[in-house]
């Protein structure tokens, strides 16, 4: 199962961990994808490692774990954020966040 | 035993296409990611493009994005590299390579093809 | 992308001798870095992933460490077979990269 805060809040300027916790006695975690809307911010590859889409690649930072920091927030990123856990055996599984990006 | 054999490079002229080959064999090639790895003469490796096991997660090198395109038949054992628009400082020996699974190390390397570009 | 920086860039050295390379990261990589070893005409062999873990067949005169930006390729005593040129490469990002290369040369 996917475990996140669905709603969380930050200041313009700052930053914000997005974080989803998965848990599973048996399954192993291959690939992380997080996206913004529908627009991709990042993959975790156990084979390949983190790739950073080059249009967030100034602001998003990997880490901690399989989260990704984000940085530099505008009024902009406010919206729903998607997590998806690849893993084998136990197949995809989703989270769901949405950020809000309050004025400072 | 596990082995990649390169194939396909020669002199090119720029702007011109080339496709390489890389035949594997001795291991489960279906269920490998793949990369592909360059060196200019006398310099140092580089590394190109890789892809998923299934044929997608086709990542590339920042330069030979838009222009070179990786790819596999499974049923072949055969992974490609399709370069386009190439340029002199394309000019290389060109490996395909094999990762350990999880490790993020290429432990398995072709012989390596050689590809010059000039006029 | 990450940048990688190995020095010294040649090293001179004789049979027997203590060699270590280093390598750093130009952002943390934690454990995500890999050494390779390659002698002219031939292709690159692995020698160690992971930071510090030694691939299978590769004497255990090679070691590695580090984590974050810094690491450290160590051979313990330099035999004949081991004036090469060494490799780190980086595999916490997309797209990997590799060092600039270290020449191991005969004294």
């Known amino acids: 199962t996917i475990d996140t805060k669905r709603n969380i809040s930050a200041e313009e300027g700052g930053s914000v961990i997005l974080q989803c916790h998965f848990s599973s006695d048996t399954a192993e975690v291959t690939q992380v994808d997080w996206k913004q809307q529908d627009q991709l911010l990042a993959i975790y590859s156990v084979d390949l490692g983190w790739h950073v889409a080059s249009v967030f690649s100034d602001r998003v930072v990997p880490g901690p774990s399989l989260g990704l920091t984000f940085q530099s927030l505008t009024m902009n990123d406010t919206g729903e954020y998607f997590c998806t856990y690849h893993t084998y055996p136990g197949g995809i599984y989703k989270g769901r966040i949405f950020l809000k990006v309050q004025e400072s | 035993q596990v082995q990649l054999v390169e194939s396909g490079g020669g002199v090119v002229q720029p702007g011109r296409s080339l496709r390489l080959s890389c035949a594997a064999s001795?291991?489960?090639?279906?269920?490998?990611?793949m990369h592909w790895v360059r060196q200019a003469p006398g310099k140092g490796l580089e590394w190109v493009a890789v892809?998923?096991?299934?044929?997608?997660?086709?990542y590339y090198a920042d330069s030979v994005e838009g222009r070179f395109t990786i790819s596999r038949d499974n049923s072949k054992n055969t992974l490609y590299l399709q370069m386009n628009s190439l340029r002199a400082e394309d000019t290389a020996l060109y490996y395909c390579?094999?990762?350990?699974?999880?490790?993020?190390?290429?432990?398995?390397w072709g012989q390596g093809t050689m590809v010059t570009v000039s006029s | 992308d990450i940048q990688l920086t190995q020095s010294p860039s040649s090293v001179s050295a004789s049979v027997g001798d203590r060699v270590t390379i280093t390598c750093r990261a130009s952002?943390?990589?934690?454990?995500?870095l890999a050494w390779y070893q390659q002698k002219p005409g031939k292709a690159p062999k692995l020698l160690i992933y992971?930071?510090?873990s030694l691939q299978s067949g590769v004497p255990s005169r090679f070691s590695g460490s580090g984590s974050g930006t810094d690491f450290t390729l160590t051979i313990s005593s330099l035999q004949p077979e081991d004036f090469a040129t060494y490799y780190c490469?980086?595999?916490?990002?997309?797209?990997?990269?590799f060092g600039g290369g270290t020449k191991v040369e005969i004294k």
């Open positions: 390579a094999k990762p350990v699974p999880r490790r993020r190390g290429l432990d398995v």
């Open positions: 001795g291991f489960t090639f279906s269920s490998s990611y």
């Open positions: 892809i998923g096991a299934d044929g997608s997660n086709k």
């Open positions: 952002q943390g990589i934690s454990s995500w």
């Open positions: 992971g930071a510090s």
């Open positions: 490469q980086q595999a916490f990002y997309l797209p990997w990269t």
